[in-house]
């Protein structure tokens, strides 16, 4: 059964940030979106091949809530709160999205405060994390995709280069944080941020709803 | 202001050969990749080749393997296309194109060659 | 044959809202960028990025994508809009572009 949806990038679980598929078969049932069943703590999810028994792939669903307290580490200085996914490898665009779906963007740097901060949430692992850092605009120049204002820099030595084919920035651990431009295409890990409001209804992702689904003869929607 | 022009093409027999060169000028030439893109008569774009800022590396759809040759000459702010051994298949108005962040942002004009006996 | 797949033609009235799209692996991983090609001209990029607009473009205009699928709208066409489109993005490393077939756009 074909069903066209937006793609929802998986947090954690064993699929390194691919997006769910839907529909999937889990215990001999089929299920159009994510799901809580199996699981005792509520948290939804998904599998990310169309058969978990047979594959057992399967991440976490995005929720946009009003809090922090899954998947986010919380800056109590600043209120803002950041999610490190070290084990998805998701191109820029497909990162940029994933943080999209929790009412989040890719990380923002605008001070040295949240450098420090950043830094050492970053001991101990060795990677290269996709920012919001990007000049894809023709406007021209770098700049953050939250747009917030591009005020204080930290890239490393000659970067940014190659204006033509490496427009999207990451944040090395090998540098101490520092930033460079990379090919949007490539596939990293990536590190949201979002800073929670108040007014902001949690609201799990039901991009499945009111669309028309297409089926195999014999097959029910 | 970016401006690429193009030149070289006309009418040649099949197997001839013919030298594109597009001249390039407001904005680094050095510091972007260049391509070559190319539209037959009633048809689509196409990608033909693409070249590194540096000339290190050199990429061409499949069609023109082994008879075209993309080349740079950054001192000049020209990109060139050698086309050898063409087939009427190649007829086409080709154009360079510079890429900007994920897109192709700046065009010439585009110039006409045309194979046939 | 195109890396990324568009219907050939659409067709849409004076002042009413189109969509064109744009389907292939590389949108996965990459933006699309839209060009509008008019006859005896060179292709002018309208709408690249997530919906970004070079100057110049009007804002009818305007792009989405989701998954695999890229998707232009025209809203409120013009008689002016009436051209090619063709989607476009990244590839891969050895063959950087990828070009749509084109969909023509016709303004009744």
């Known amino acids: 059964c074909a069903l066209p949806y937006h793609e929802v990038y998986t947090i954690q679980g064993n699929s390194h940030g691919k997006p769910c598929t839907i529909p999937f078969k889990y215990d001999n049932q089929w299920f159009h979106g994510c799901t809580s069943t199996g699981r005792e703590d509520g948290h939804l999810w998904c599998a990310t091949t169309q058969d978990y028994g047979k594959d057992e792939r399967w991440g976490f669903c995005p929720i946009k809530s009003n809090d922090c307290e899954t998947f986010w580490d919380k800056d109590q200085l600043t209120d803002s709160c950041y999610q490190f996914n070290f084990q998805s490898t998701l191109s820029w665009r497909e990162a940029w999205a994933s943080c999209e779906q929790q009412g989040a963007d890719l990380l923002s740097i605008t001070e040295i405060h949240e450098q420090t901060y950043i830094n050492g949430l970053l001991t101990g692992y060795s990677s290269t994390l996709w920012i919001g850092l990007n000049d894809l605009d023709t406007s021209g120049g770098w700049q953050w995709s939250d747009n917030s204002p591009l005020k204080y820099l930290n890239w490393e030595s000659d970067q940014p280069d190659n204006p033509s084919e490496e427009n999207c920035g990451v944040i090395r651990t090998e540098s101490s944080g520092g930033w460079q431009n990379r090919d949007c295409s490539i596939a990293l890990p990536y590190v949201c941020k979002k800073k929670p409001n108040a007014t902001a209804e949690p609201t799990p992702p039901d991009r499945w709803a009111n669309v028309k689904v297409e089926c195999e003869p014999s097959w029910q929607p | 202001e970016v401006q690429l022009v193009e030149s070289g093409g006309g009418l040649v027999k099949p197997g001839g050969s013919l030298r594109l060169s597009c001249a390039a000028s407001?904005?680094?030439?050095?510091?972007?990749?260049m391509n070559w893109v190319r539209q037959a008569p009633g048809k689509g774009l196409e990608w033909v080749a693409n070249i590194k800022p540096d000339g290190s590396e050199r990429h061409s759809v499949d069609s023109v393997k082994g008879r075209f040759t993309i080349s740079r000459d950054n001192s000049k702010n020209s990109l060139y296309l050698q086309m050898n051994s063409l087939r009427a298949e190649d007829t086409a108005v080709y154009y360079c194109?510079?890429?900007?962040?994920?897109?192709?942002?700046?065009w010439g004009q585009g110039t006409l060659v045309t194979v046939s006996s | 044959s195109s890396e990324l797949t568009q219907d050939p033609a659409v067709s849409v009235a004076l002042g009413q809202t189109v969509r064109i799209t744009c389907q292939g692996d590389?949108?996965?991983?990459?933006?699309a960028s839209w060009y509008q090609q008019k006859p005896g001209q060179a292709p002018v990029l309208v709408v690249y990025?997530?919906?970004g607009r070079p100057s110049g473009i009007p804002d009818r205009f305007s792009g989405s994508s989701s998954g695999n699928t890229a998707s232009l709208t025209i809203t409120g066409a013009q008689a002016e809009d009436e051209a090619d489109y063709y989607c476009?993005?990244?590839?891969?490393?050895?063959?950087?572009?990828?070009f749509g077939g084109g969909t023509k756009v016709t303004v009744l």
């Open positions: 194109a510079r890429p900007g962040a994920g897109r192709l942002d700046y």
């Open positions: 476009n993005s990244r590839n891969s490393s050895t063959h950087p572009w990828a």
């Open positions: 407001g904005f680094t030439f050095s510091s972007y990749s």
């Open positions: 590389s949108l996965r991983s990459n933006f």
């Open positions: 990025v997530k919906n």
